[in-house]
Amino acid sequence: GSMAHSDGIFKKEQAMCLEKIQRANELMGFNDSSPGCPGMWDNITCWKPAHVGEMVLVSCPELFRIFNPDQDMGVVSRNCTEDGWSEPFPHYFDACGFDEYESET
């Protein structure tokens, strides 16, 4: 079913994200003690590492296109602050119609 299909997509996206973060950390010279916000997979989408004061924008994940193929994709942002990543704005549920990955149960 579509959820089984989406399960595979999410696992693939997560693996790709972790690779992207590793590459970005190397390019930006980020390590665990660096100021700023580490890259992260938030169980929905991938956030690249960012410097304090930077706003990062991402599109709603490709999975949303499976459920809504004809729609423009929403955009979600997070700010990198001295305290770390801000909450996403808008929240995924409002921007994308979906706020967490559901596995088949």
């Epitope: 729609q71 423009d72 808008p90 929240h91 409002d94 921007a95 119609g97 967490e100 149960t105």
Partner: antibody, heavy 123, light 107 residues
Framework: QVQLQQSGPGLVKPSQTLSLTCAIS??????????WNWIRQSPSRGLEWLGR?????????HYAVSVKSRITINPDTSKSQFSLQLNSVTPEDTAVYYC?????????????WGQGTLVTVSS | DIQMTQSPSSLSASVGDRITITCRAS??????LNWYQQKPGKAPKLLIY???MLQSGIPSRFSGSGSGTDFTLTINSLQPEDFATYFC?????????FGPGTKVDIK
């Protein structure tokens, strides 16, 4: 055809609990594409979204900050209905209360509404 | 909370007129905006979602446009059943907030 039928008392005393129910026909409260919302309308505050419940493998709620400490929205899957409880009411909570179904297509919108229930808070 | 304002607050028009109602958001809301029509004693009725998408069953004389902070609802060739109050609503951020309404009455 989706229909929402509201029920509950029209008069509530200050400090008591306002309780309303919204019965769903033509859809299910467990529909994974829908959300189930409560909105109220008064001359002083206009239309005010209060919150919603929805099912995505588990039940979730979102509430407006203005009522968050006093509100509960509960689904009842056995009767395919959902309810609103608003505690510690004051005369400012006097309003017409509506239930509505939320659907997603590029954004969330309210496409089917209940008939509305005028609730007066007065002793 | 995102504040929604509408103008005018009321307008008088005749059958056959073309009217435009404006809605402004206090911050950028992309196209996460809906329009509703309400008649006295009735619940609001969805007309337009996502700024410009016509809800199923709504006549094509209704149209929506805009993005960012400024939006418009246009009714071409106003019909007798269109005399009502119209509300915009942002759907980008909870709590979803509504405009104060624009009442359209008969001139």
């Amino acid at each position: 055809q989706v229909q929402l039928q509201q029920s509950g008392p029209g008069l509530v005393k200050p400090s008591q609990t306002l309780s309303l129910t919204c019965a769903i026909s033509g859809d299910s409260v467990s529909n994974k594409q829908a959300t189930w919302n409560w909105i109220r309308q008064s001359p002083s505050r206009g239309l005010e979204w209060l919150g919603r419940t929805y099912y995505r493998g588990k039940w979730k709620n979102h509430y407006a900050v203005s009522v968050k400490s006093r509100i509960t929205i509960n689904p009842d899957t056995s009767k395919s209905q959902f309810s609103l409880q608003l505690n510690s009411v004051t005369p400012e909570d006097t309003a017409v209360y509506y239930c509505a179904r939320g659907m997603w297509n590029q954004n969330w919108f309210l496409d089917h509404w209940g008939q509305g229930t005028l609730v007066t808070v007065s002793s | 909370d995102i504040q929604m304002t509408q103008s005018p607050s009321s307008l008088s028009a005749s059958v056959g007129d073309r009217i435009t109602i404006t809605c402004r958001a206090s911050q950028y809301i992309v196209r996460y905006l809906n329009w509703y029509q309400q008649k006295p004693g009735k619940a609001p009725k969805l007309l337009i979602y996502a700024a410009n998408m016509l809800q199923s069953g709504i006549p094509s004389r209704f149209s929506g446009s805009g993005s960012g902070t400024d939006f418009t609802l246009t009714i071409n060739s106003l019909q007798p059943e269109d005399f009502a109050t119209y509300f915009c609503q942002q759907a980008i951020n909870q709590p979803y907030t509504f405009g104060p309404g624009t009442k359209v009455d008969i001139k």
